[in-house]
């Protein structure tokens, strides 16, 4: 049943809560069999996804999965929004679901989740198994 279709493992409604000023790596998990596809990131602007041309990206290869990473060094308030990765493979374009970044500006600390909110929303504390950033599902 194992197919050699390229798969992008970004789940529908995936979200990340991050702080402005921190470094952050947004991962696009990619499964491929032989030749690594060409992968790009874009940022949604309404219904259009604007390709991110001048941003630092990198690949991280693991045993059964690869990650195409978009680097935020550091996160800026206007990085808030939804992003999508796309893979070109054998003249097919495969698009991921969008993943949303919620950027909290450290200057407005009042907007940061309170202890009570953290207690009631423990997923804010869930740490991704590749990076030490907060996930917000």
């Amino acid at each position: 049943k194992e197919s050699c279709d390229v798969q992008l493992y970004i789940k529908r409604q995936s979200e990340h809560s991050i702080l402005a000023g921190d470094p952050f790596e947004l991962e696009c998990p990619v499964k491929y069999c032989a030749n690594r596809p060409h992968v790009t990131w874009c940022k949604l602007n309404g219904t259009t996804c604007v390709k991110l041309e001048d941003r630092q990206t990198s690949w991280k290869e693991e045993k059964n999965i690869s990650f195409f990473i978009l680097h935020f060094e550091p996160v800026l308030p206007n990085d808030n929004g939804s992003y999508r990765c796309s893979a070109n493979f054998q003249s097919n374009l495969i698009e991921s679901h969008s993943t949303t970044l919620y950027v909290t500006d450290v200057k407005s600390a009042s907007e940061r989740p309170s202890k009570d909110e953290m207690a009631s929303r423990p997923w804010l504390l869930y740490r991704h198994h590749h990076h030490h950033h907060h996930h917000h599902h």
Partner: antibody, heavy 121, light 112 residues
Framework: QITLKESGPTLVKPTQTLTLTCTFS??????????VSWIRQPPGKALEWLAH???????RFNPSLKSRLTITKDTSKNQVVLTMTNMDPVDTATYYC?????????????WGQGTLVTVSS | DVVMTQSPLSLPVTLGQPASISCKST???????????LNWFQQRPGQSPRSLIY???KLDSGVPDRFSGSGSGTDFTLKISRVEAEDVGVYYC?????????FGQGTKVEIK
Amino acid sequence: QITLKESGPTLVKPTQTLTLTCTFSGFSLSTFGMGVSWIRQPPGKALEWLAHIYWDDDKRFNPSLKSRLTITKDTSKNQVVLTMTNMDPVDTATYYCARGNWDGETYFDYWGQGTLVTVSS
Amino acid sequence: DVVMTQSPLSLPVTLGQPASISCKSTQSLLDSDGKTYLNWFQQRPGQSPRSLIYLVSKLDSGVPDRFSGSGSGTDFTLKISRVEAEDVGVYYCWQGTHFPWTFGQGTKVEIK
């Protein structure tokens, strides 16, 4: 060979909490793309999706039942556990677990045999 | 929630003849990623559901090619080119584009 099997009580009383376990083999819930859903079917009626857990422990619930449901996984034991609180006779159904495979998003390709749960005093 | 409406609810068929089941959704199932998450399941009497078709028209492994799926947007069809005795059961469509994921009410296929 991929198999899933549901286990738990066949009879629960109203207001009690139901705990069901899905034990599976032939795949790992730590593999990217994998997930397990719980789906139920009241006698003679249609299927209803309840909850899903993904490879990275992310979870999704049917909003109509969300306040009553929890779903957890034990990757080392190849198990997924569903709990449903405050059971009512209308929750009488066959409860299935199904593997969520991935082709751009989840789809169910293997199902367990189901376990009939009756809610009655 | 997206409501999936199947028709007919009961389908008496003659062995060897074709059969067709319709499934309509209250919202388009075309996702923003360009895929349409519409699946079909078969549930034989006394058995658990079995995956037949995913992504509208992809046949799952081990499914005979007399089954086919088609459609787009909100209108979908499952076709059996020549019905066999083992095809008796209830057929469900399912959408995975919108949360919560929802099933149709089922179409019962029986032999005339």
